[in-house]
C-alpha cells in the first residue's frame, strides 16, 4: 500500500469454533455513517464470524487496495480522494471469497450536517 495504516487486530470469532455456517461478513465504519470532516480519521473494521480467521482484503470503488491482509483499515488525514465506497473481502481456505456490503465514505465540509452529494472534493 502506500503507507500501511492498516493495523492487525485480533478478535475472537462470533460463532462457535466448530461452526461451518457461512456467516455474513460485517463491515463497521467509524465514525458511524461514514461522514467525516476533512483531516479526520476513518476506521473500517471487517468482522468475520469464522474460525480459523480468514484473510481480509479491501476494495475501494470496486478496485482492490494495494494492502497486506488486515481486518482493520485506518485512513487518517482524510482528503477528497478518500471519498467513495469501501468493502472488505474475506477469503477462507475452505470456500470462496465473501464480500461485505459496501459503505460510503464522504467528507462533511464545515457547516454541513451530513454526507455530501454532488461534486467530490469541492470545486
Amino acid at each position: 500500500m502506500g503507507s500501511s495504516h492498516h493495523h492487525h487486530h485480533h478478535s475472537s470469532g462470533l460463532v462457535p469454533r466448530g461452526s461451518h455456517m457461512l456467516e455474513e461478513v460485517q463491515l463497521v465504519v467509524e465514525p458511524e455513517g461514514g461522514a467525516v470532516a476533512p483531516g479526520g480519521t476513518v476506521t473500517l473494521t471487517c468482522e468475520v464470524p469464522a474460525q480459523p480467521s480468514p484473510q481480509i482484503h479491501w476494495m475501494k470503488d470496486g478496485v482492490p487496495l494495494p494492502l497486506p491482509p488486515s481486518p482493520v483499515l485506518i485512513l487518517p488525514e482524510i482528503g477528497p480522494q478518500d471519498q467513495g465506497t469501501y468493502s472488505c473481502v474475506a477469503t477462507h481456505s475452505s470456500h470462496g471469497p465473501q464480500e461485505s456490503r459496501a459503505v460510503s465514505i464522504s467528507i462533511i465540509e464545515p457547516g454541513e450536517e451530513g454526507p455530501t452529494a454532488g461534486s467530490v472534493g469541492g470545486s
Epitope: 502506500g2 500501511s4 480522494q81
Partner: antibody, heavy 120, light 107 residues
Framework: QIQLVQSGPELKKPGETVKISCKAS????????MNWVKQAPGKGLKWMGY????????IYSEEFKGRFAFSLETSASTAYLQINNLKNEDTATYFC?????????????WGQGTSVTVSS | DIVMTQSQKFMSTSVGDRVSITCKAS??????VAWYQQRPGQSPKLLIF???NRYTGVPDRFTGSGSGTDFTLTLSNMQPEDLADYFC?????????FGVGTKLELK
C-alpha cells in the same frame, strides 16, 4: 499548509552520484507514500516508482531498477532519490509527489522539482 | 504496461472556447484516472481524480468524464491561465503511466 520542498539544482558529470531530497510539511509524513516522477527537457512525465513511508518498501518501474534508489529519513519527514553512475540521459527535472497508496489514488501534492544536468 | 494515448499533442484554442482533450487506455482501468495541469516552469497540479471528480479548488470549468478505456477532460470557457500542458494518468495498476500530454496554445 501541505508542502513538498525539494533540494536545489545539480550539475554533475557522467559516472557521478546525485541525491535529491524532498521534505514534507503540513501533514503526517508516514500517512502517505511518496512517488518519484522524471521529466526530461521538453518531454512528458514518467513514473519512476514509489516508497512506502511506513515500511520503507520501494516499488520501482522496470526502467528505473538498478541505478536508482529511494530512501527515507522519517524523523525529518524527508524522502530521497539517489541516482548512481549518472548518464547524460538522466538530465531531467525530478519531482516528488505524494499519494496515499501506490494505486487507487492520484498524486495530490507535488514538489517544485529538482533539475539535474549531467554533462562532461 | 498500460499505455495512455493522448493523440492530440497540441491544440489551438481561443479565450472562451470549449476544449475537449481525450485519452485512451490500452486496457480497462475502470475510473482510476487522474488529469494534471502543468503550466510552464511549474510542477503538475491535480485537476481530476477517479476520472470525473474535481479536486479541491479546481474551477468548475474543468470536467472529467469516461470509464474503462476512454477518457475526456473538457474545459469550458477557456481562460488565459489555462494555457498549459495536460496529462492523463492511470493508477489502476503499476507501473503508473501518463499520457504524453496535450499542450493548449492560443490560435
Amino acid at each position: 499548509q501541505i508542502q513538498l520542498v525539494q533540494s536545489g539544482p545539480e550539475l554533475k558529470k557522467p559516472g557521478e552520484t546525485v541525491k535529491i531530497s524532498c521534505k514534507a510539511s503540513g501533514y503526517t509524513f508516514t500517512n502517505f507514500g511518496m512517488n518519484w516522477v522524471k521529466q526530461a527537457p521538453g518531454k512528458g512525465l514518467k513514473w519512476m516508482g514509489y516508497i512506502n513511508t511506513n515500511t520503507g518498501e520501494s516499488i520501482y518501474s522496470e526502467e528505473f531498477k538498478g541505478r536508482f534508489a529511494f530512501s527515507l529519513e522519517t524523523s525529518a519527514s524527508t524522502a530521497y532519490l539517489q541516482i548512481n553512475n549518472l548518464k547524460n540521459e538522466d538530465t531531467a527535472t525530478y519531482f516528488c509527489a505524494r499519494s496515499r497508496m501506490v494505486t487507487a489514488y492520484g498524486m495530490d501534492y507535488w514538489g517544485q522539482g529538482t533539475s539535474v544536468t549531467v554533462s562532461s | 504496461d498500460i499505455v495512455m494515448t493522448q493523440s492530440q499533442k497540441f491544440m489551438s484554442t481561443s479565450v472562451g472556447d470549449r476544449v475537449s482533450i481525450t485519452c485512451k487506455a490500452s486496457q480497462n482501468v475502470g475510473t482510476a484516472v487522474a488529469w494534471y495541469q502543468q503550466r510552464p516552469g511549474q510542477s503538475p497540479k491535480l485537476l481530476i481524480f477517479s476520472a470525473s471528480n474535481r479536486y479541491t479548488g479546481v474551477p468548475d470549468r474543468f470536467t472529467g468524464s469516461g470509464s474503462g478505456t476512454d477518457f475526456t477532460l473538457t474545459l469550458s470557457n477557456m481562460q488565459p491561465e489555462d494555457l498549459a500542458d495536460y496529462f492523463c494518468q492511470q493508477y489502476s495498476s503499476y507501473p503508473l503511466t501518463f499520457g504524453v500530454g496535450t499542450k493548449l496554445e492560443l490560435k
